[in-house]
């Protein structure tokens, strides 16, 4: 009988005596086998000990010379921890960052909503100056055009799922020269006809620009 084999153990064939070196019917385990953790369940004024391979949620395994035991996580807003001062899972609504729990991620870090962790975000440089106002690669011949500014990605995010902020943006601008030097003026009727064409061209250019920005962001 394997219970009799260990002379040091005072086992009762009871499931709560699993892993015990010393056990009683009323109080369960009072000492555990070497690699197990002692946990004391308290119910009102009564208690019984258990020997566990891993500690319950809210506790961590504390190794001690006399006996390993489960000890309570005392890190603010922490649900489970690895040690006295390193959290592994925060309470709902808090983000995990370097073993601590925060209500928002520190600067330069982005929240991963599926794991509620703060990971290194996408780092971008400063905006460039606004570019020249142009349309159809021309800087004259139209009343309105678009000017663009850009910024570089300094550091790629730790995970591909973290989006980078916009790295290029455009805005409507008034051309410096509506008429190109040496160009012929069009009659009023022709001007009206071309107005519709021009509006459509701007719309299409803006659409293409949006598509370009979106694909550019995906490629990053």
């Amino acid at each position: 009988n394997r219970w009799r084999r260990n002379k040091r153990a005072s086992y009762v064939s009871n499931p709560i005596c699993k892993g015990c070196l010393s056990c009683s019917k009323d109080n369960g385990c009072s000492r555990c086998q070497q690699k197990l953790f002692f946990f004391l369940r308290r119910e009102g004024m009564r208690q019984y000990g258990e020997c566990l391979h891993s500690c319950p949620s809210g506790y961590y395994g504390h190794r001690a010379p006399d006996m390993n035991r489960c000890a309570r996580c005392r890190i603010e807003n922490c649900d489970s921890c690895f040690s006295k001062d390193f959290c592994t899972k925060c309470k709902v609504g808090f983000y995990l960052h370097r073993g601590r729990c925060f209500d928002e991620c520190p600067d330069g870090f982005a929240p991963l909503d599926e794991t509620m962790e703060c990971v290194e975000g996408c780092e971008v440089g400063h905006w460039s100056e606004w570019g020249t106002c142009s349309r159809n690669n021309r800087t004259c011949g139209f009343k309105w055009g678009l000017e663009t500014r850009t910024r570089q990605i300094v550091k790629k995010p730790a995970k591909d799922t973290i989006p980078c902020p916009t790295i290029a943006e455009s805005r409507r601008c008034k051309m410096a020269m509506r008429h190109c030097p040496g160009g012929k003026r069009t009659p009023k009727a022709k001007e009206k006809r071309n107005k519709k064409k021009r509006r459509k061209l701007i719309e299409r250019a803006q659409e293409q620009h949006s598509v370009f920005l979106a694909t550019d962001r995906v490629n990053q």
Epitope: F38, F39, L40, G44, D66, A71, R72
Partner: antibody, heavy 125, light 107 residues
Framework: EVKLVESGGGLVKPGGSLKFSCAAS????????MSWVRQTPEKRLEWVAS???????YYPDSVKGRFTISRDNVRNILYLQMSSLRSEDTAMYFC???????????????????WGQGTSVTVSS | DIVMTQSHKFMSTSVGDRVSITCKAS??????VAWYQQKPGQSPKLLIY???TRHTGVPDRFTNSGSGTDYTLTISSVQAEDLALYYC?????????FGGGTKLEIK
Amino acid sequence: EVKLVESGGGLVKPGGSLKFSCAASGFSFSSYAMSWVRQTPEKRLEWVASISSGGSTYYPDSVKGRFTISRDNVRNILYLQMSSLRSEDTAMYFCARGGDPGVYNGDYEDAMDYWGQGTSVTVSS
Amino acid sequence: DIVMTQSHKFMSTSVGDRVSITCKASQDVSSAVAWYQQKPGQSPKLLIYWASTRHTGVPDRFTNSGSGTDYTLTISSVQAEDLALYYCQQHYSTPWTFGGGTKLEIK
């Protein structure tokens, strides 16, 4: 710095009542269990009462039904109401942080990690 | 109730000596033992909990050993300021109980 200051002790006649308090500062009072421990004139320490952070109360049989522990988490004050006092209740009463019989912590809060300076109670006719 | 017995009411020692204060529980208390020091005119102070863990700020000359029912508080090199009453307490099951105390006297 954890600070516990008791007040309200004094001389009471047998059968009489007394309520004293312990003002806590320097820690998150509402998060901790609190206890009362007394020291007899012979210097023996005896556990008197405990209250969990959630308000559950625990007493030894010697004071059950006569003593009531309570707490005010807004004002950070622990109380002990004593009635039907006996001569054997004569002691120095200390308030202490920790010692919750209802919760296992596996750390310092299972013991009583900080104590006040104590308040003296004498029950005599 | 669990009875905690400190067999020596008084212990006399000299500065620099190693001293051991013993405590015996009436049943196995699973290392759930705390030690307190009470200096003259002061309130008790926690030294050790869970049999071997020193409380914040406690000098490392204070150690505890033991398991089951027998526990020993050892001061490796006694200092003049260690003159005090020492109590053991079990925090295993209610009612919490204390030993009768051991008064450490410096020769």
